[in-house]
Interface confidence: low
């Protein structure tokens, strides 16, 4: 009821609590002497439905049968009107409409932890919509039940507050929620358990690792456990890896070897446990604890390459080159590498330890067979040394690979292909590829790159260091004991025309013919490797279309020769470069008249 | 425990479509990720699809891919797989894993908490 309903009263039958589906009958009855003044036969009673009018009647009561009230609430409020007056409230009621509880199911307990408390859970079914009260029983040996209830209208998990302990590790305890509203009630299946059953170990606690020796192949994991745990699961990774590798281990007693761990590397380790073989859950994951192994000292070998140059009669210039040992081979932190130069016949040897660089270049005289030998230091040792004999890699003719060809892979890739030597193909031991950016003045310190290619291979896919739009000076080797042989070819992965024509600096005359001579367009607007030059020619204030030279592109030319102008006729003179996408625009225009005499 | 319940399996014939269910017990099935797998008479067992918890990111072995869908339904406890242009390399019995801890899984199962008891799916040529 609601208000003091001093003028009347709501009765609600059969009850204020019914089940969904039912009728209701409401009546409204005024008390005496409580209608309208002086005109009780003009008393109008109206049952409001919330604030929505749904009967009427005049008297001194109302009766109004209620269907189809939905699940939940619904407040009725019934008010008086004479006339000449606003409506005067009379009394009110609420309504409550749920369902009978469902049976709880899925009933399940636990206990964290040995000396944790057993908490247990169920699914409610279909909500009530009504005050429910939950009641849960846990029976156990020597027929002792614990008991406890919650009053929350979504009540799906209680804590007894209880422990159950080992003493009887196979003693039977059995759980049951039972759930009761005003209409009906409902119990779970029993749920029958064992202390072995419902304990969930704490996760393990306190873990370490040490390695024996400073060696990552003799490495122990420390930590602590619940004393009854039986079991562990051990899980591992590198730091920067998803995937875990798992260990199961009984009796561990807190300690397990790990063999199979890789030097210097940050690795995750997480360690859960059980207290019987098939009984129970796995606790929690432990806290994560990260530990870097060990080094160890480095496996595999540099890869080595090399070039040379001539200095003048007595000197050339070796340039050593190698690349970093992969992570796994590394082992640890390369501290430095060795590099040791040795003249074979004279038996001088030099060693250098080279840090912060992966190259090294040194003057040695042209005489002599020398030979080196470079391998990679961390805090535990060295790498084998990689030895390789200074050769001239293009001397041997025979051995230079035929019909070299370099084209465009998709993006940022070339596909080299080559045909063996003329040479005996099978001697061949190996091919190498190296490939730089093309510069001009043949920059020395432009960076190398290189790939080695089995002997009877005749491709490959460069993509290291393959920028677009620009050219690259691409050498094939074939390497048979101390000899080799190399052809080189021009490559790009992808190119336009150029974006500007060469520029002419200058024009001279000699012995009747004329001498041009250019400045190399900038590499950056080359848009690839250069094909051709073109030397267009026209009389100054001519229509007529221009004359042209086209001459093949070389690296180190700068100037060309025409001889084909006209004695005191004034010429204006251009230039363009071509890729296989096309020519460039216009260089300058140069205006000349050649001096010489007519023929 | 969390119990897997598949349905939906059957014989049909080739370029037919079928859908599997998984029907799995336990409150916290929005925390599961789920999975499909199969086992082909005479094979090992295979990964098929999983999808995560919140049903966000699917992954499938790439001799489902465009024709198979695993969607979730997490109110209904549900995890289906809609199997379209079947094949008669489809054939095996069909079972349904949860992930529950999160941990690695891996395409032979490792990883996987629970598992269905298994639906059998034929395609006949």
């Known amino acids: 009821k609601i208000d003091a309903c001093k003028r009347g009263d709501v009765t609600v039958k059969p009850s204020h609590v019914i089940l969904l589906g039912s009728t209701v009958n409401i009546t409204c009855s005024l008390k005496p002497r409580q209608g309208c003044f002086h005109y009780s036969r003009r008393n109008k009673l109206i049952l409001y439905k919330f604030d929505r009018r749904i009967n009427f009647h005049h008297g001194h009561s109302l009766n109004s049968q209620v269907t189809g009230l939905p699940l939940g609430t619904t407040l009725f409020v019934c008010k008086l009107a004479c006339i000449n007056s606003d409506e005067i409230q009379i009394c009110g009621a609420e309504i409550f409409v749920g369902v009978a509880p469902e049976q709880p199911q899925n009933l399940s307990c636990i206990q964290k932890g040995e000396q944790g408390t057993v908490a247990c859970t169920w699914e409610r079914g279909r909500d009530t919509h009504l005050y429910t009260e939950y009641t849960l029983q846990l029976s156990g040996p020597k027929n002792l039940t614990w008991q406890k209830q919650c009053k929350d209208i979504y009540c799906d998990y209680l804590d007894f507050g209880i422990n159950l302990t080992p003493e009887s590790p196979e003693s039977n305890f059995t759980a049951k929620v039972t759930a009761v509203n005003s209409l009906g009630s409902s119990s779970s299946l029993p749920s029958t358990f064992t202390f072995l059953d419902i304990v969930r170990p704490l996760p393990p606690w306190d873990i370490r690792i040490k390695f024996q020796k400073a060696s990552v192949s003799r490495c122990t994991l420390y930590w602590r456990d619940e004393g009854l745990v039986l079991l562990n699961r051990l899980r591992y990774r590198p730091s920067n890896s998803r995937l875990w590798n798992m260990v199961n281990v009984t009796k561990a007693k807190g300690r397990h070897d790990l063999l199979d761990l890789k030097p210097f590397t940050e690795y995750e380790f997480q360690i859960s446990s059980k207290l019987h073989l098939y009984k129970g859950s796995w606790s929690d994951w432990s806290e994560s604890l990260r530990a870097q192994t060990p080094e160890e000292e480095p496996t595999g070998m540099l890869d080595v390459w090399y070039m040379k140059r001539h200095i003048d009669y007595s000197r050339q210039q070796i340039s050593l080159f190698w690349k970093n040992l992969s992570v796994s081979e590394a082992r640890g932190k390369i501290l430095h590498y060795q590099v040791t130069l040795q003249e074979l016949t004279g038996g001088k040897a030099m060693t250098q330890n080279i840090t912060g660089h992966t190259s090294w270049t040194t003057v040695i005289p042209r005489t002599g067979n020398w030979a080196v030998a470079v391998s990679a230091a961390n805090s535990k040792g060295s790498s084998l040394p990689t030895r390789i004999n200074i050769m001239n890699l293009c001397e041997a003719g025979l051995l230079a690979p035929r019909q070299v060809s370099a084209n465009s892979e998709g993006m940022d890739n070339i596909l080299v292909t080559w045909q063996p030597p003329r040479k005996d193909p099978s001697a061949v031991q190996e091919y190498v590829v190296e490939w730089r950016e093309l510069h001009p003045g043949g920059d020395t310190q432009v960076p190398l790159n290189w790939l080695r290619s089995r002997p009877y291979n005749v491709s490959a896919l460069i993509s290291e260091n393959i920028k677009s739009y620009i050219c690259y000076e691409i050498r094939v080797y074939a390497l048979s004991g101390d000899q080799g042989g190399c052809s080189s070819i021009l490559g790009n992965s992808k190119h336009k025309a150029p974006l500007s024509g060469p520029h002419i600096n200058a024009i001279t005359e000699e012995k009747g013919s004329i001498l041009i001579s250019w400045n190399s367009i900038p590499v950056q607007e080359q848009m690839g490797c250069l094909l051709h030059y073109r030397i267009y020619w026209k009389e100054r204030d001519s229509n007529s279309q221009p004359q042209l030279c086209e001459i093949p592109y070389r690296v180190s030319q700068n100037s060309h020769p025409i001889n084909s102008l006209q004695p005191r006729v004034t010429y204006v003179l251009w230039m363009t470069a071509l890729t296989a996408a096309g020519e460039s625009s216009h260089g300058n225009e140069r205006e000349f008249c050649l001096q010489g005499k007519a023929n | 425990q969390v119990q897997l319940v598949e349905s939906g399996g059957g014989l049909v014939q080739t370029g037919a479509s079928l859908r599997l269910s998984c029907a799995a017990s336990?409150?916290?099935?929005?925390?599961?990720?789920m999975a499909w797998f199969r086992q082909a008479p005479g094979k090992e067992r295979e990964f098929v699809a999983h999808?995560?918890?919140?049903?966000?990111?699917?992954t499938y072995a790439d001799s489902v891919k465009g024709r198979f869908t695993i969607s979730r339904g997490n109110a209904l406890n549900t995890v289906y797989l809609q199997m379209n242009s079947l094949k008669p390399e489809d054939t095996a019995v069909y079972y349904c894993a949860a992930n529950v801890d999160g941990s690695a899984w891996s395409t032979l199962g490792a990883g996987m908490d629970y598992w269905g008891k298994g639906t059998l799916v034929t395609i006949s040529s």
């Open positions: 336990g409150r916290t099935f929005g925390r599961y990720e």
């Open positions: 999808i995560s918890s919140s049903g966000l990111t699917t």
